[in-house]
């Protein structure tokens, strides 16, 4: 089965929907090979029979109306379906359900009853039909301004449910962007791999990175990003001066703005690149970024020397996609296995380095840097979310702190670098930052505020600072670091934590923790999340189980211990309609939560109260 296709299964009858003809939609023993049983979403609310390239619909919104197949019409109210609670499936905006088995009727009918015979799943899963939801495919080039492919579409009186090369000599795959190409003549190429599709991209000969300039399209920022992602790419990020110069040349003949990946869509943080590249190079148009609310997305202006301007994300523009090795210098971020034996007194170890906050004696940035270097280190450079979360959660960082780190643009204006010379691989700006205020003299960077995010600051301001040095193998672990915890467990706040040593299913991991007189970890707030991210994020394993799942009640996530879910840290598109158990990711998306099948094997984190901690009283109900 193509990933978009599925069989519509009723668990009670143990049968699947079978389209025998356009006027007869019945059920049969499930057979994943049978074309007549394959269906797929072709819009947010329409389901198409793969065999007939026609859509499921009804003649009227009435009880006991027959469900049959019709020419797909995105405007028809009689072809709009929706998933309701608990695998119920029916016509949109009604309480009439897709039903089989009542009154000895062989055909699928609309029925007002919401019993087991009106409940449908994707065959072979526990998921409702909407879990295989429609994903719009944005066309490229052509004459339709990047519009979405309309499946099925008619060409030379034949219906196509997929991209086709029909009518072309070059084999390029295309789609109609209305249901009737013969009438409307609107088309675009499909964002798929086919012979010659590399011609859709421009390759920078210096870096090998590929760029796609979609100047004829007119999409919102989010649509543009979806289009790039469909091609295993992302909206453009610019981290190097050379890259900006290459793009200036590439776009010089164009006049209209093009979406790039820069945005301030995260409420808690500042400017960031979609895809996670560090925001370290600034190329704003004079007067930008505008502080007007809602202008959270950024376009590159070819006519204005390819400088950047922030706009409302719903504007429709062309866009630039980027794929291939990132422009970041090759740099090995230490993994957790490189953790040293320890650090000098008052310094804290993490992944091969030692860290210390100095807040007693405030210094201007230059003198703070000198002080760190005198101790054998440098102002702290931060290369990953894990390292950031370690500093934030384990160094004694305080919400009212404002501390120098090593990032600055002293050498080249608008191009931030670390004072220790390591490459910039990560940034975490506060909202509205970097602002380059005070006559553009904010050349140094501080970590500040309750989240420890960053802001640029005038370097002459006396502040506390964070030093970092390479660890010395003979040094000692800070005293009392894991007080109240058994050997091998790590202390944070009132709790002890252990990383499970074996790959286990969710159930087995839960048993292991119980045997250790602990439980699969809960996450109560962002401080605990930051600690856990720093604990597991750099490890080579892909996932670590937490105690969260919706196995007891699909759609309602609960911890294995009866604690309220008060904090979440979902990855993009999670939990969606997925059912299962929740694990923390490592790597680029370090610490973010994904829903996995509970039978998958992953490492895990156990948690229990530390010895000597006075527990709060149990809440009374």
């Amino acid at each position: 089965l193509d990933a978009r296709q599925f069989l519509i299964y009723n668990e009670d009858h143990k049968r699947c929907v079978d389209a025998l003809s356009a006027i007869s939609v019945q059920t049969a023993t499930c057979n994943p090979e049978a074309e007549s049983q394959k269906f797929r979403w072709v819009s947010d609310s329409q389901i198409m029979s793969v065999a007939f390239k026609l859509c499921l619909g009804v003649p009227s919104k009435t009880d006991w109306a027959s469900v049959t197949l019709y020419a797909c019409d995105s405007k028809s109210e009689y072809q709009k379906w929706e998933c309701k609670n608990d695998t119920l499936f029916g016509i949109k905006g009604t309480e009439l359900y897709f039903n089989y088995g009542n009154r000895q009727e062989k055909n699928i009918k609309l029925y007002k009853g919401s019993g087991l015979w009106s409940r449908w799943k994707v065959y072979g899963t526990t998921d409702d039909l909407c879990s295989r939801g429609y994903e719009a495919m944005y066309s490229l080039l052509g004459n339709a301004n990047g519009a979405v492919c309309a499946f099925p579409f008619k060409f030379e009186n034949k219906w196509y449910a997929d991209c086709t090369s029909a009518g072309r000599s070059d084999g390029w795959l295309w789609c109609g962007t209305t249901t009737d190409y013969d009438k409307d003549k609107l088309f675009g190429f499909c964002p798929l791999h086919f012979e010659g599709s590399e011609r859709l991209w421009n390759k920078d000969p210096l870096t090998g990175i590929l760029y796609q300039i979609n100047s004829k399209s007119a999409l919102t920022w989010h649509q543009a990003r979806a289009s790039c992602k469909q091609q295993n790419a992302d909206l453009l990020s610019v981290t190097e001066i050379h890259e900006q110069m290459y793009l200036t040349g590439l776009t010089s003949s164009l006049s209209s703005g093009l979406w790039i990946g820069l945005n301030s869509l995260s409420v808690r943080s500042g400017w960031q690149w979609a895809g996670g590249s560090p925001f370290r190079y600034l190329n704003w148009l004079p007067g930008s970024p505008s502080s007007e609310p809602g202008k959270s997305c950024v376009s590159l202006n070819p006519g204005k020397n390819a400088k950047w301007e922030n706009l409302e994300c719903v504007q429709k523009l062309g866009y630039i996609c980027k794929k291939g090795n990132n422009t970041l210098n090759p740099f090995i971020i230490p993994s957790a296995s490189d953790v040293p034996t320890g650090c000098p007194n008052q310094w804290w170890p993490y992944a091969g380095h030692c860290y210390r906050i100095h807040r007693e004696e405030k210094k201007i940035q230059k003198y703070a840097l000198q002080a760190c270097r005198k101790e054998g280190g440098d102002l702290a450079s931060i290369h990953s979310i894990e390292e950031f979360d370690f500093i934030f959660s384990q160094l004694g960082y305080e919400p009212n702190d404002e501390l120098w780190i090593g990032l600055n643009d002293i050498k080249i204006q608008m191009y931030f670098e670390w004072s220790d010379g390591t490459p910039v691989t990560f940034t975490k700006w506060l909202p509205g930052e970097p602002s380059h205020e005070n006559n553009r003299q904010e050349d140094c960077v501080v970590m500040k505020g309750k989240d420890g995010y960053w802001a640029d600051r005038a370097c002459e301001q006396p502040l506390g600072y964070i030093c970092k040095m390479v660890s010395q193998s003979h040094a000692v672990v800070p005293e009392g670091a894991d007080k109240g915890c058994r050997k091998g467990w790590k202390r944070h706040g009132f709790y002890c934590y252990l990383i499970g040593s074996t790959l286990s299913t969710f159930t087995d991991a839960n048993h292991t923790c119980t045997n250790e007189k602990a439980y699969l970890t809960t996450v109560e707030d962002r401080y605990e999340q930051a600690f856990l991210t720093s604990l597991v994020g750099l490890r080579p394993e892909k996932y670590f189980w937490t105690g969260l799942s919706d196995v007891q009640n699909k759609g309602t996530f609960r911890w294995t211990v009866d604690e309220q879910v008060q904090f979440t840290h979902w990855n993009a598109d999670m939990p969606g309609r997925k059912a299962g158990c929740v694990a923390m990711k490592t790597g680029v998306a370090g610490g973010l939560w994904d829903v996995l099948s509970c039978e998958e094997k992953a490492k895990f984190v156990c948690k229990h109260w530390a010895e000597g901690v006075t527990r709060p009283p149990e809440p009374t109900t």
Epitope: L141, R168, S169, W172, F187, R199
Partner: nanobody
Framework: QVQLQESGGGLVQPGGSLRLSCAAS????????IGWYRQAPGKQRELVAT???????NYADSVKGRFSISRDNAKNTVYLQMNSLKPEDTAVYYC?????????????WGQGTQVTVSS
């Protein structure tokens, strides 16, 4: 824009040969592939042969082993060598170019050249 000019058509006896030429001009760098199509009276236009930018070729089953498509990059010309011609090959032969900037699915067409196979 791409302009296409066909030549080389004519009257030939069954079993004979002809070589058609298609000269391309204009924005030739945008061309992905050039194909030959034909249309006999009262019939649908059908694909005969194609050659892509990378040099891969493709033929209709009815002409495999008899027709051969080739190109001369220096002259921006594509050729269709037609051997062992049959009366059913009689048609107007059209040259077609597909580019990545096509504003309709079919791309660009030449005016066509008539090929008649008759004794």
């Amino acid at each position: 824009q791409v302009q296409l000019q066909e030549s080389g058509g004519g009257l030939v006896q069954p079993g004979g040969s002809l070589r058609l030429s298609c000269a391309a001009s204009g924005n030739i760098f945008s061309i992905n592939a050039i194909g030959w199509y034909r249309q006999a009276p009262g019939k649908q236009r059908e694909l005969v042969a194609t050659i892509t930018l990378s040099g891969s070729t493709n033929y209709a089953d009815s002409v495999k082993g008899r027709f051969s498509i080739s190109r001369d990059n220096a002259k921006n010309t594509v050729y269709l060598q037609m051997n062992s011609l049959k009366p059913e090959d009689t048609a107007v032969y059209y040259c077609n170019a597909n580019t990545y900037s096509d504003s309709d699915v079919y791309g660009y067409w030449g005016q066509g050249t008539q090929v008649t196979v008759s004794s």
